[in-house]
């Protein structure tokens, strides 16, 4: 399957957070997305093949890595003045 | 900082097994990525020999592969080159070599290289 | 294999000059991904070869503007806008797109 964590996160002004997706399905491609209260997913960012990720509609204010197959941590980063949010990680072949 | 550093010796005999060590700094050669021996001819070609991932799975390039093994040893941070059967043609600089953060496979951590001259 | 075509095989060029360098592959590197694994590498005498550009034309973190990188399909081009002294050096294109991951033969950059 597939699991992200942790299932809530605070985080301290000025700070730097990082979200974990760990996968097991042999999955080569994986996608970080983010919603807001009352819209759709928007796709921050995707990755296709380990160590090769591209930005995806709202990539500002986050970064990844793809160190390895089954894992594609996103960090919010201080510059994200924005961060509250649900956050939805997925993978697919 | 990604480091590497190969060793071994800079002289074979013909028909004798190469063996070669990359020792890396900085990063845990189980954590990601994919660990790579590259080898520049005498006359500046360069050739992919194959890598070792992260998870111990390797791929080769097929021209050597009946020849080549690539295998790790995680308690030194380490992954080492055995090629068999050397002839004067594999006479190279060979270098250890590992990707940057986010290029694909494209590499930009490299070892010195180590000259290796297949002589009698 | 790939086979990975540079051309010129040698070049000489004055410090200021504009500099194209091509590379011709043997099959589409175009990745089932859709992204394209053509990579340019520069290296100079007694050294390791140094990434420049990847993925065609992402110029690698430290590297001058002047140098950008360009193409499609089977077809790839290496630019320096303006060579400096420290540009003259042997450049290599690569693709990662199909296993063996292959080299262009180098072409040797020389003042003129």
């Known amino acids: 399957g597939i699991t992200q964590s942790p299932k809530y996160l605070f985080r301290k002004e000025g700070q730097n957070v990082t979200l974990s997706c760990e996968q097991n399905l042999n999955h080569d491609a994986m996608y970080w997305y983010r919603q807001d209260p009352g819209q759709g997913l928007r796709l921050i960012y995707y990755s296709q093949i380990v160590n090769d990720f591209q930005k995806g509609d709202i990539a500002e204010g986050y970064s990844v890595s793809r160190e390895k197959k089954e894992s594609f941590p996103l960090t919010v980063t201080s510059a994200q003045k924005n961060p509250t949010a649900f956050y939805l990680c997925a993978s697919s072949i | 900082q990604v480091q590497l550093q190969e060793s071994g010796p800079g002289l074979v005999k013909p028909s004798e097994t190469l063996s070669l060590t990359c020792t890396v700094s900085?990063?845990?050669?189980?954590?990601?990525?994919?660990w790579n021996w590259i080898r520049q001819f005498p006359g500046k070609g360069l050739e992919w020999i194959g890598y070792?991932?992260?998870?111990?799975?390797?791929n080769y390039n097929p021209s050597l592969k009946s020849r080549v093994t690539i295998s790790r040893d995680t308690s030194k941070n380490q992954f080492s080159l055995k090629l068999s059967s050397v002839t004067a043609a594999d006479t190279a600089v060979y270098y250890c070599a590992s990707p940057s953060p986010g290029t694909g496979y494209a590499v930009d951590y490299w070892g010195q290289g180590t000259t290796v001259t297949v002589s009698s | 294999d790939i086979q990975m075509t540079q051309s010129p095989s040698s070049l000489s060029a004055s410090v200021g000059d504009r500099v194209t360098i091509t590379c011709r592959s043997s099959q589409s590197l175009v990745h089932s991904n859709q992204n394209t694994y053509l990579h340019w590498y520069q290296q100079k005498p007694g050294k390791a070869p140094k990434l420049l550009i990847y993925k065609v034309s992402n110029r690698f973190s430290g590297v001058p503007s002047r140098f950008s990188g360009s193409g499609s399909g089977t077809d790839f081009t290496l630019t320096i806008s303006s060579l400096q002294p420290e540009d003259f050096a042997t450049y290599y294109c690569?693709?990662?797109?199909?296993?063996?991951?292959?080299f262009g033969q180098g072409t040797k950059l020389e003042i003129k």
């Open positions: 690569s693709q990662s797109t199909h296993v063996p991951f292959t």
């Open positions: 900085g990063y845990s050669i189980t954590s990601g990525y994919f």
């Open positions: 070792i991932s992260y998870d111990g799975s390797n």
